[in-house]
């Protein structure tokens, strides 16, 4: 696939326009229920979440329901159907399994209470793709400088298990970040399409943290970071074969 996608605001066959879903968390200024996030980990399923602060307050709105439309008839009528699964994605959520998910049509969703709409959003699945974290991070030593002060390492990882990389259904790009353990700011490397990357000029006497996250190429947003990989580089004196190093 090519092209870049961000956020949808309309359903193509609907004569109305709606505010778009922001894949990130939204601030909820009013106490009415609001959509907070919709996410697809692998372009085959997705879930949407909402706030429900009002039910903990004084105002009684009645049960919150999610309705969606994914295909309109030629008369432009909206066929709203209720959430197929309120359970699988946790509290205040709706989960759409693969039978309810296609990247080839626009979706609109709305929250209702007592028959009234309290929030309404539209998007396409590709815009809400946020992959699961990369897994199985490991590292190997590449080189140590002649001075014994710096070393280069190769970091490797695997794509998330649910990302169909082999058939090209998902093309992921990865961002690696690293820092010394006692630092607060992460150093960011340029995005890459491979599942390994060299990291150069690390200080031998320091311990480093490395993490990786991924996004679908040309669309969607970065997913969560992997678990942190800790890299401890041995002192020069621990190396026995000096001719291996430059």
């Amino acid at each position: 696939f090519s092209g870049s996608e961000a956020t949808a605001a309309i359903l193509s066959r609907a004569p109305w326009s709606l505010q778009s879903v922001n894949p990130g968390l939204k601030t909820n200024s009013s106490k009415e229920p609001k959509f907070t996030k919709c996410r697809s980990p692998e372009r085959e399923t997705f879930s949407c979440h909402w706030t429900d602060e009002v039910h903990h307050g004084t105002k009684n709105l009645g049960p919150i329901q999610l309705f969606y439309t994914r295909r309109n008839t030629q008369e432009w009528t909206q066929e709203w159907k209720e959430c197929p699964d309120y359970v699988s994605a946790g509290e205040n959520s709706c989960y759409f399994n693969s039978s309810f998910t296609s990247i080839w049509i626009p979706y609109c969703i709305k929250l209702t209470s007592n028959g009234g709409t309290v929030d309404e959003k539209c998007f396409s699945v590709d815009e809400i793709v946020q992959p699961d974290p990369p897994i199985a991070l490991n590292w190997t030593l590449l080189n140590v400088s002649l001075t014994g002060i710096h070393a280069d390492i190769q970091v490797r990882w695997e794509a998330p298990r649910n990302a169909d990389i082999q058939k090209g259904w998902m093309v992921l790009e990865y961002e690696l970040q690293y820092k010394e353990v006692n630092e607060t700011k992460w150093k960011m490397m340029d995005p890459i399409l491979t599942t390994s990357v060299p990291v150069y000029s690390l200080k031998v006497d320091k311990e480093y943290e490395v993490r990786v996250r991924s996004k679908q190429r040309n669309s969607g947003n970065y997913g969560e970071f992997s678990e942190v990989l800790y890299v401890t580089l041995p002192q020069m004196s621990q190396f026995t074969c000096e001719e291996d190093f430059y």
């Epitope: 996608e5 605001a9 193509s12 085959e44 296609s102 049509i105």
Partner: antibody
Framework: EVQLVESGGGLVKPGGSLRLSCAAS????????MDWVRQAPGKGLEWVAE??????????YYAESVKGRFTISRDDSKNTLYLQMNSLKTEDTAVYYC??????WGQGTLVTVSS | EIVLTQSPGTLSLSPGERATLSCTAT???????LDWYQQKPGQAPRLLIY???NLASGIPDRFSGSGSGTDFTLTISRLEPEDFAVYYC?????????FGGGTKVEIK
């Protein structure tokens, strides 16, 4: 009433280029997801490309058979969809249909690639 | 990609008869994302049925669709003269959108 009118087809030599246009009316074009679908003479239908609305950042998708050679684009101010076809091959010979998310179709324009 | 195979290739029937057209997918397709089109000679395809069983605008109720998983069916209960045409199934579920090869319904 939705109307889609294609133009720009014709005879072109292999390796040549052609630009198809589709004039749209009867719906809010700027909000629409638009596709090109083609049909080789006496054959079935083949999806070619899709372009989404401005709200979707005009995201584009292509069939593997045309990726890197064809470019779908749109001009919302003119209610017009385009298909720029480069490096044409004989197997690209077909009637090209402009469609509104494959629900409404134009009458098509014939592209013949032959030496 | 998901390949759709339509059978039979040609169906020879008389007006008033029942027509049953089959569409088989190489992998499972959600019923929400399977459509049928009708195409007459020299004309563009026309959406007939969407989401397996829903009639598109202006389509008479002698047309009906059914199926799930990998097997889908278009049925014309009583063929009218204007129904003789080529019919295509179309999926847009997981892979790129694909069409079946078509079934020609011709007058016997």
């Amino acid at each position: 009433e939705v109307q889609l009118v294609e133009s720009g087809g014709g005879l072109v030599k292999p390796g040549g280029s052609l630009r198809l246009s589709c004039a749209a009316s009867g719906f809010t074009f700027s909000d629409a997801w638009m596709d090109w679908v083609r049909q080789a003479p006496g054959k079935g239908l083949e999806w070619v490309a899709e372009i989404r609305s401005k709200a979707n950042y005009h995201a584009t998708y292509y069939a593997e058979s045309v990726k890197g050679r064809f470019t779908i684009s749109r001009d919302d101010s003119k209610n017009t969809l385009y298909l720029q076809m480069n490096s044409l091959k004989t197997e690209d010979t077909a009637v090209y249909y402009c469609t509104l998310i494959r629900d409404y179709w134009g009458q098509g324009t014939l592209v013949t690639v032959s030496s | 990609e998901i390949v759709l195979t339509q059978s039979p290739g040609t169906l020879s029937l008389s007006p008033g008869e029942r027509a049953t057209l089959s569409c088989t997918a190489t992998s499972s397709v959600s019923s929400s994302y399977l459509d049928w089109y009708q195409q007459k000679p020299g004309q563009a395809p026309r959406l007939l049925i969407y989401s397996t069983s829903n009639l598109a605008s202006g389509i008479p109720d002698r047309f009906s669709g059914s199926g799930s998983g990998t097997d889908f069916t278009l049925t014309i209960s009583r063929l009218e003269p204007e129904d003789f045409a080529v019919y295509y199934c179309h999926q847009y579920h997981r892979s790129t959108p694909t069409f079946g090869g078509g079934t020609k319904v011709e007058i016997k």
